[in-house]
Interface confidence: medium
């Protein structure tokens, strides 16, 4: 019995269907086929879980969270024992193993391994201003998405004709911050943060209004 090499990893957007490949060759009839799919979850690597089982001609559910979402892609028994996972969730990310036995066929490699990564687009980021908006002050524009896998990067733009940030601004696309030093009237305006990763983008807006000091009355 020999399980075929499978592609190292599968990536899928959250909520979509993932297909995890596993196929084998055997010299025996598929009368005693036994297939166990296991996962080592990324979130809990010391607790492997059963995903789905096929033994004695019957299919059995694995861990509760897979119930009703997992099945074999083809009619069993078969030498293609790939599975699908519907409505993928973040917790499905992990290393999946198919363990195949088909007595009396012994020997050979009976395990296939495939990684699954569930990708999540950035959630709507939050835009905030830190610091005083008085003329001449320093302000920090903050942008952060609660969700996003891979981790989003953040791009700030000023929504005027140029889309350029003020010359006194420095941007950190990883942290999602823009520091604007010595703000002036020209710093006022609408700013947009674009959070993006491999599978999506999301934006938020922020209105910066620089406060000029009131002239003193004599």
């Amino acid at each position: 019995l020999e399980v075929s090499e499978s592609p190292g990893s599968v990536q899928v957007a959250r909520g979509q269907t993932a297909v995890l490949p596993c196929a084998f060759s055997t010299s025996a009839a598929l009368l005693n086929l036994n297939v166990i799919w296991m996962v080592i979850p990324l979130s809990n690597a010391n607790q492997p879980e059963q995903v789905i089982l096929y033994q004695g001609g019957q299919m059995f559910d694995g861990a509760l969270r897979f119930h009703g979402r997992v099945g074999f892609t083809g009619t069993m028994p078969a030498t293609n024992v790939s599975i699908f996972i519907n409505n993928t969730q973040l917790s499905d990310t992990g290393t999946y193993q198919c363990l195949v036995n088909n007595l009396p066929d012994r020997g050979g490699r009976n395990i296939g391994v495939t990684g699954l990564t569930v990708l999540v687009p950035p959630s709507a980021p939050q835009c905030q201003i830190q610091g005083s908006q008085d003329l001449g002050s320093d302000v920090i524009l903050l942008c952060s998405s609660e969700e996003g896998i891979p981790r989003p990067t953040y791009l700030w733009e000023k929504l005027d004709n140029t889309l350029k940030l003020p010359p006194t601004a420095t941007q950190d696309q990883v942290q999602g911050t823009v520091t604007i030093r010595n703000i002036s009237a020209l710093s006022s305006g609408l700013y947009q943060c674009v959070a993006s990763n491999a599978i999506g983008t999301s934006t938020c807006l922020l209105d910066l209004q620089v406060i000029s000091p009131q002239p003193r009355s004599v």
Epitope: S43, Q47, Q50, D61, L64, R65, Q89, L90, S91
Partner: antibody, heavy 120, light 108 residues
């Protein structure tokens, strides 16, 4: 050591509302699916509803008799499970248990229960 | 709606074997769990996934599940085993949980 401690039970009039809490400790609460189960005096166990972990979607399911009246929620930052009960009926009188769902489906840990009495 | 049926009561002499059944349509296609509940106490899981025993549960407790019936077997029953026993099944499609009506085990 896993611990689940319910609170918030008491006497309430029909049509009234009550919120039960369940404080969890001894395990990673944010990864756990949690349920409420109730037991009317002298009767059997009855499943009320369940909430998945946030990473599993955070969705809820409810038993038919409480659907639309009861709401299960969780605050992972406080390791606390909630049961908001509205439009209470006399038949909702029971001891309410919070329980953790084992990865393979059964409830592996239970709280001590809190009594809810709905009476005029 | 799905129902699980248990006998209301079962009696057994100390040291003998007690069997408690739980019946439901094609129950053997689902996993069954069993709980023990003593008066004034919370339920305790004694069997899950048809036949698995959680740590701390004595070996005299065993379970099986096939066809339409799951069975909890207590061999060498002891006085401390006197309690109510509930079966449970998880319904994957609806996401709901169903308990049996419970069986009172009396150790004579």
């Amino acid at each position: 050591e896993v611990q689940l401690v319910e609170s918030g039970g008491g006497l309430v009039k029909p049509g009234g509302s009550l919120r039960l809490s369940c404080a969890a400790s001894g395990f990673t609460f944010s990864n756990a699916w949690m349920s409420w189960v109730r037991q009317a005096p002298g009767k059997g166990l009855e499943w009320v509803g369940r909430i998945k972990s946030k990473t599993d979607g955070g969705t809820t399911d409810y038993a038919a008799p409480v659907k639309g009246r009861f709401t299960i929620s969780r605050d992972d930052s406080k390791n606390t499970l909630y049961l908001q009960m509205n439009s209470l009926k006399t038949e909702d009188t029971a001891v309410y248990y919070c329980a953790r769902l084992h990865i393979y489906g059964p409830f592996d840990y239970w709280g001590q229960g809190t009594l809810v009495t709905v009476s005029s | 709606s799905y129902e699980l049926t248990q006998p209301p009561s079962v009696s057994v002499s100390p040291g003998q074997t007690a069997s408690i059944t739980c019946s439901g349509d094609k129950l053997g296609d689902k996993y069954a769990s069993w709980y023990q509940q003593k008066p004034g106490q919370s339920p305790v899981l004694v069997i899950y996934q048809d036949s698995k025993r959680p740590s701390g549960i004595p070996e005299r407790f065993s379970g099986s599940n096939s066809g339409n019936t799951a069975t909890l077997t207590i061999s060498g029953t002891q006085a401390e085993d006197e309690a109510d026993y509930y079966c449970l099944s998880y319904l994957a499609r609806s996401g709901s949980v169903v308990f049996g009506g419970g069986t009172k085990l009396t150790v004579l």
